[in-house]
């Protein structure tokens, strides 16, 4: 039975606006037409769902209404944005894919990406 | 090194019932996965249940409402609890962890459901 490799940065800083992205590959063992993507906070031992999409192959990713994470796929590849971050919001965020249909089921975890956020700095007063 | 040990196989009458453990050894990411697989004789090897350790659970079709999956964290052990065993679950079942960028296999341990 073979493994399923995820592969993720190592690490990624968010932007001024709390903006994070990165990528998540995934080597499929076979033909998978149904993909669930799940992203994971941990932190201090402490594991919590972000987000979670489950697609089509060839479809758009579709996140819940209320969803801090946006997502692009291409092939083997899913491109994960997450928004509103501040910065108690750093910790390392894991990427887990699993294989949903046609079976056998796959699932992989990825190392995980250290996502640093750095809150900006408030703008000082003026006068103008 | 991680390694997974099983225990807990046999034989066992139709209708029965068996608990399967799976004990893991080595440094476990904090977050990981324990599964149990099962492979009957001729065949691939198919998922029946796995547990994440945030306590996330999901069960393959053919071991809902018979198969109950569990673990201790601290123990580092998994269990699967079988009732109400029928001769078509007979397989060995093998333990499966998943850690971040990796995953392991445990060796097995054979149930034979049979009169």
């Known amino acids: 039975c073979k493994a399923m490799h995820v592969a993720q940065p190592a690490v990624v800083l968010a932007s001024s606006r709390g903006i994070a992205s990165f990528v998540c590959e995934y080597a499929s063992p076979g033909k998978a037409t149904e993909v669930r993507v799940t992203v994971l906070r941990q932190a201090d031992s402490q594991v919590t769902e972000v987000c979670a999409a489950t697609y089509m192959m060839g479809n758009e990713l579709t996140f819940l209404d209320d969803s801090i994470c946006t997502g692009t796929s291409s092939g083997n590849q899913v491109n994960l944005t997450i928004q509103g971050l501040r910065a108690m919001d750093t910790g390392l965020y894991i990427c887990k894919v699993e294989l949903m249909y046609p079976p056998p089921y796959y699932l992989g975890i990825g190392n995980g990406t250290q996502i640093y956020v750095i809150d900006p700095e408030p703008c000082p007063d003026s006068d103008f | 090194e991680v390694q997974l040990v099983e225990s807990g196989g046999g034989l066992i009458q139709p209708g029965g019932s068996l608990r399967l453990s799976c004990a893991a050894s080595g440094s476990i990411s904090s977050y990981n996965v324990m599964g149990w697989y099962r492979q009957a004789p001729g065949q691939g090897r198919d998922l029946v249940s796995h547990?994440?350790?945030?306590?996330?659970?999901m069960y393959a079709d053919s071991a809902k409402g018979r198969f109950t999956i569990s673990r201790d964290n601290a123990k580092k052990t998994l269990y699967l609890q079988m009732n109400s065993l029928r001769p078509e679950d007979t397989a060995v079942y093998y333990c499966?962890?998943?850690?971040?960028?990796?995953?392991?296999w445990g060796q097995g341990t054979l149930v034979t459901v049979s009169s």
């Open positions: 547990i994440a350790s945030n306590g996330e659970i």
């Open positions: 499966k962890l998943w850690v971040l960028g990796n995953d392991y």
